[in-house]
């Protein structure tokens, strides 16, 4: 998955600050939106005559199967890496942005 190498193995929240975490999260969301748009464009170009193409289009109409699942994993990895999220102002409070995205799909 895109960005996976950037997220895997990050051992400690001190590797990034909260501010940098938000920026990285924003970059992930932006990449997800771009990829989503690319897939939607691909779907529009596919011919309905091909059963393989149409089944793929049906699968991909549920973005959770195609794209968001991948990015949600990345976001969840990122959240897990941070241990408790990035909020120092509200110690101990988890900011699960990834699950928030999942709820919104």
């Amino acid at each position: 998955a895109p960005f996976r190498s950037a997220l895997e193995g990050l051992p400690d929240p001190t590797a990034l600050s909260e501010k940098e975490g938000r920026l990285l999260l924003a970059a992930l969301v932006k990449a997800y939106v771009q990829r989503k748009n690319e897939l939607e464009q691909e779907q529009e170009q596919e011919t309905e005559g091909s059963s393989l193409d149409s089944s793929r289009a049906k699968r991909c109409s549920n973005l959770s199967t195609c794209v968001l699942g991948t990015y949600s994993k990345d976001l969840n990895n990122f959240h897990t890496f941070s241990g408790i999220g990035f909020g120092a102002e509200t110690p101990g409070k988890k900011r699960d942005i990834a699950s928030g995205l999942e709820r919104g799909r």
């Epitope: 400690d12 929240p13 001190t14 990034l16 600050s17 408790i84 120092a88 102002e89």
Partner: antibody, heavy 112, light 112 residues
Framework: VEESGGRLVTPGTPLTLTCTVS????????INWVRQAPGKGLEWIAY?????GSSYASWAKGRFTISKTSTTVDLRITSPTTEDTATYFC???????????WGPGTLVTVSS | DPVLTQTPSSVSAALGGTVTINCQAS????????LSWYQQKPGQPPKLLIY???KLASGVPSRFSGSGSGTQFTLTISGVQCDDAATYYC??????????FGFGGGTEVVVK
């Protein structure tokens, strides 16, 4: 982690200390510089994140600059004074949930 | 930066006795528990004993323990050994648009 660049300098002469890391990547671990004056306690100086973001102790702003390459982290003492005489440690830490790695330190002596 | 006030500055302990060192932070630390304890002996870099306020670092004897949350923390050495004679430091971290760290002033432990 291993520090280098410590030496005797005269006040006002800029000095750059280098921390060379091996066995782990600066893309995954942040680095801090900490110093200890002879017979004194530990003082945190500066931090650099995996993305290159930096922060400084309030007393160190303007006096020090932290930067990094793929395998090294530099600490520049912009205009050393005698008060900067200390052993300077490069540290993978303090960290929240993993163990620290401290270098042996490099001695900086500022004297006229 | 977080200001960490460590007390006492020096303590004398009987062999087999108990030592308690306190550390007070000027503000709540990250997740209320970003507090580490270090042991330092002359000529050596600090050695991590406790992280996340109460977790024992690998290879550290169980006679060392840490407790506390928010701004008040304690290191306890139970059954003090001769080898425990050293200087002990607390260190804490906060994240407010960047990581900032601070060290306590140190506590010298003398074993009688």
């Amino acid at each position: 982690v291993e520090e280098s660049g410590g030496r005797l300098v005269t006040p006002g002469t800029p000095l750059t200390l280098t921390c060379t890391v091996s066995g782990f990547s600066l893309n995954r671990y942040a680095i801090n510089w900490v110093r200890q004056a002879p017979g004194k306690g530990l003082e945190w100086i500066a931090y650099i994140s995996i993305r290159g973001g930096s922060s400084y102790a309030s007393w160190a702003k303007g006096r020090f600059t932290i930067s990094k390459t793929s395998t090294t982290v530099d600490l520049r003492i912009t205009s050393p004074t005698t008060e900067d005489t200390a052993t300077y440690f490069c540290v993978r830490g303090p960290t929240y949930q993993i163990e620290d790695i401290w270098g042996p330190g490099t001695l900086v002596t500022v004297s006229s | 930066d977080p200001v960490l006030t460590q007390t006492p500055s020096s303590v004398s302990a009987a062999l087999g006795g108990t030592v308690t060192i306190n550390c007070q932070a000027s503000q709540s630390l990250y997740n209320n528990n970003f507090l580490s304890w270090y042991q330092q002996k002359p000529g050596q870099p600090p050695k991590l004993l406790i992280y996340q306020a109460s977790k024992l670092a690998s290879g550290v004897p169980s006679r060392f323990s840490g407790s506390g949350s928010g701004t008040q923390f304690t290191l306890t050495i139970s059954g003090v050994q001769c080898d425990d004679a050293a200087t002990y430091y607390c260190a804490g971290g906060i994240d407010i648009d960047g990581w900032y760290f601070g060290f306590g002033g140190g506590t010298e432990v003398v074993v009688k």
